[in-house]
């Protein structure tokens, strides 16, 4: 009876999410393998988040709006491990917007989800950021490594969206 009611709850939750995400990919987790954590298909998952790489070339503001429509934000990178996971799926000859910007050009960088900007956990390429007119951040491959660069916000780029996993 307990299992039946849990299944019914799951199904109703799935139906609720289906209007936003036509397909979810779920895995069982938790100590009793009773919880399901899901990401929209074909998003990828790492720890408690889901990631989507958009190959549509758009400005930073349009890229953030595009993520927002999907219930996400442009990616906020919190650790080197997270960055290493994300870059496995990126093309080395492309650049991708991050959820990091400096709208006033005062070198006051801010993450889209209001996570505090911690200078000690940043992965700027050497010599970057280097221009107060370049107020948005991308991740790209340079000098044999992935890192961040400041660029013009209005210049179309690919982008990466991030959202919290859906638990059912």
């Amino acid at each position: 009876n307990f299992m039946y009611s849990k299944t019914v709850k799951r199904l109703s939750k799935l139906q609720e999410y289906q209007q936003y995400y036509p397909s979810l990919t779920c895995v069982m987790e938790g100590k009793d393998m009773e919880d399901w954590s899901c990401c929209p298909t074909p998003w990828t998952s790492f720890q408690s988040s889901c990631y989507f790489i958009s190959t549509v070339m758009q400005s930073w503001t349009k890229s953030q709006n595009n993520c927002s429509v999907m219930g996400a934000d442009l990616v906020v990178i919190n650790t080197k491990e997270e960055q290493d996971f994300i870059t496995q799926n990126l093309k080395i000859n492309s650049a991708y917007f991050l959820g990091l910007s400096d709208p006033k050009g005062w070198r006051h960088w801010q993450w889209v989800d209001q996570t505090p900007y911690n200078k000690n956990v940043t992965f700027w390429h050497s010599g970057e950021p280097n221009s107060p007119d370049e107020r948005c951040a991308i991740i790209n491959f340079r000098s044999e490594e992935w890192g961040w660069n400041d660029v013009h916000c209005h210049v179309p780029q690919k982008s990466i969206c991030k959202m919290k996993k859906i638990y059912i």
């Epitope: 400005s59 953030q64 709208p103 107060p132 007119d133 107020r135 209005h154 210049v155």
Partner: antibody, heavy 121, light 111 residues
């Protein structure tokens, strides 16, 4: 006082080339993105090319891509527009304009007086 | 590309009256309270001159008779009261995304 002075315009045959120059003074030229904007006779404004302050980024509309090249010489405080394979529809007054960044975009806060390019056989 | 449609194409106004020009964008040019729409004035034989930046900010040296408003896709330039030397073409321009685009222009004539 900010000044932008264009030169290099003239009459050219279809298929020909011209190089426009813009001499900047009164501001730190190397700190600003610059653009060329044109205006065909009796028509509106059309953006033609942009170059970033550090020369790392150039951008063109499809109408001129592959034919026009924007460049700059920060040591000479000069902006250039190399125009090749010119067509009758490139006939216009060409303005050099300074970009001032605001939030996620920019606007053109100073414009030169313009130089006239006429493409005709 | 973002298309900007200005209206009317032309208008005639008497001195002392109000002139209103609208600019509609094919998609939003606003983001989190910042509106990346700008207005220019161009008199015959002269280059464009910046009047208003970011929808409502008056450029230094521009008379307070000029004002701008709007957000998202709909923006307005108002001249109130109109003076004889306001006869000119007026253009809107967006810069939220490359390529930067201009409206087709509005010709203001003084009656």
């Amino acid at each position: 006082e900010v000044q932008l002075v264009e030169s290099g315009g003239g009459l050219v045959k279809p298929g020909g080339s011209l190089r426009l120059s813009c001499a900047a003074s009164g501001f730190t030229f190397s700190s600003y993105g610059m653009s060329w904007v044109r205006q065909a006779p009796g028509k509106g404004l059309e953006w033609v090319a942009t170059i970033s302050s550090g020369d790392s980024y150039t951008y063109y509309p499809d109408s001129v891509k592959g034919r026009f090249t924007i460049s700059r010489d920060n040591a000479k405080n000069s902006l250039y527009l190399q125009m090749n394979s010119l067509r009758a529809e490139d006939t216009a007054v060409y303005y050099c304009a300074r970009q001032l960044y605001y939030s996620y975009g920019y606007y053109f806060d100073y414009w030169g007086q313009g130089t006239t390019v006429t493409v005709s056989s | 590309d973002i298309v900007l449609t200005q209206s009317p194409a032309s208008l005639a106004v008497s001195p002392g009256q109000r002139a209103t020009i609208t600019c509609r964008a094919s998609e939003s040019v606003s983001f989190h309270g910042t509106h990346l729409m700008h207005w220019y004035q161009q008199k015959p034989g002269q280059p464009p001159k910046l009047l208003i930046y970011a929808a409502s900010n008056l450029e230094s040296g521009v008379p307070a008779r000029f004002s701008g408003s709007g957000s998202g896709t709909d923006f307005t330039l108002t001249i109130n009261p109109v003076e004889a030397n306001d006869a000119a073409n007026y253009y809107c321009q967006q810069s939220i995304e490359d390529p930067p685009t201009f409206g087709g222009g509005t010709k203001v004539e003084i009656k």
